[in-house]
């Protein structure tokens, strides 16, 4: 069993290295930004129509494109729940220093947990997405 786990871990590691999780990160950041804009909550209220075109996050098409590419990547982890969890943890880790507020962090986590389901995949049962609050000091 230990040998199998070791092989499984190695397989997961190489899957993670091969995967391009950026589309997932882009999709989630656009989603939480758009939600914040459309509800007009602190810290920013919409100064334009939240769905008007902009070079960045208000491209509805861009976002769904990111989601599609994200789901294709996550699909690779469908048969390994623990590896799926590690992929989600990696996404959280990569974006944690962009989230300098508790609400933003919690919202990102919520959307991240829902991501497999949005892609029509099984969500890992237990998956700890905790990071140090406010992200890592990497500089």
């Amino acid at each position: 069993r230990q040998q199998w786990e070791l092989q499984g871990d190695r397989r997961c590691q190489s899957q993670l290295e091969r995967a391009n999780l950026r589309p997932c990160e882009q999709h989630l950041m656009q989603k939480i930004q758009r939600d914040e804009d459309s509800y007009g909550r602190d810290p920013y209220s919409p100064s334009q129509d939240p769905y008007s075109p902009s070079p960045y996050d208000r491209r509805g098409a861009g976002s769904s494109q990111h989601q599609e590419r994200c789901c294709n990547e996550l699909n690779e982890f469908e048969n390994n729940q623990r590896c799926m969890c590690e992929a989600l943890q990696q996404i959280m880790e990569n974006q944690s220093d962009r989230l300098q507020g508790r609400q933003q962090e919690q919202q990102f986590k919520r959307e991240l947990r829902n991501l497999p389901q949005q892609c029509g995949l099984r969500a890992p049962q237990r998956c700890d997405l905790e990071v140090e609050s406010g992200g890592r000091d990497r500089y």
């Epitope: 996050d57 990111h66 300098q100 507020g101 406010g134």
Partner: antibody
């Protein structure tokens, strides 16, 4: 209404220490990263330090690393900047600012003047 | 460290006319999540700075729509479509990709 009020500034000799405070009201203080930014007389803005909402992560500009320490007391809605080994070039108005949650400096205090002079 | 360079450093303007300020960073400010971590701030005479634009192109709440931000990577621009007398002050760009760094500022004054 958001209010950030800095205090603790004054005249201090080179090599000495000073502690600045920033009292926050009208905001969810313990939900956001907080920053210190300074402005030397007649000069531009210089980011100094930041601290994450739980106080776990601290970030510093190279110019103050090892001399300044940022901290916060969420139970008192107060941000601090402990400044040691002060130099003449630390003379500036020090502002505290609240992060938007996405790394922008959304709310600013009025500032407190620190003068380092012998 | 990322270095921010603004131009011009001084900008005399005529009310009603457009104005633009340029900001260049020593490295790309695009994060892997697709956002440009570049803000614009205005410090009016005798006041604290205020946020105008965040993430390169989004106007902060309450900022008049005559202000707009554009650009990506290392080159960014703040435009004022029609300058008003109350727009005078020093404009700063700031990168928030790696910690935080301000540009040296652009002083906008009425001709």
């Amino acid at each position: 209404q958001v209010q950030l009020v800095e205090s603790g500034g004054g005249v201090v000799q080179p090599g000495r220490s000073l502690r600045l405070s920033c009292a926050a009201s009208g905001i969810a203080f313990n939900d956001y990263t907080m920053h210190w930014v300074r402005q030397a007389p007649g000069k531009g803005l210089e980011w100094v330090a930041a601290i994450s909402y739980g106080g776990t992560n601290k970030y510093y500009a190279d110019s103050v690393k090892g001399r300044f320490t940022i901290s916060r007391d969420n139970s008192k809605n107060t941000l601090y900047l402990q400044m040691n080994s002060l130099r003449a070039e630390d003379t500036a108005v020090y502002y505290c600012a609240r992060d938007s949650g996405y790394r922008s400096l959304l709310h600013w205090g009025q500032g407190t003047l620190v003068t380092v002079s012998s | 460290d990322i270095v921010m360079t603004q131009s011009p450093l001084s900008l005399p303007v005529t009310p009603g006319e457009p104005a633009s300020i340029s900001c260049r960073s020593s490295q790309s400010l695009v994060h892997r999540n697709g956002y440009n971590y570049l803000d614009w701030y205005l410090q009016k005479p005798g006041q604290s700075p205020q946020l105008l634009i965040y993430m390169a192109s989004k106007r902060a709440s309450g900022v008049p729509d005559r202000f707009s931000g554009s650009g990506s990577g290392t080159d960014f621009t703040l435009k004022i479509s029609r300058v008003e007398a109350e727009d005078v002050g020093v404009y700063y760009c700031m990168q928030a990709l790696q910690t935080w760094t301000f540009g040296q500022g652009t002083k906008v004054e009425i001709k």
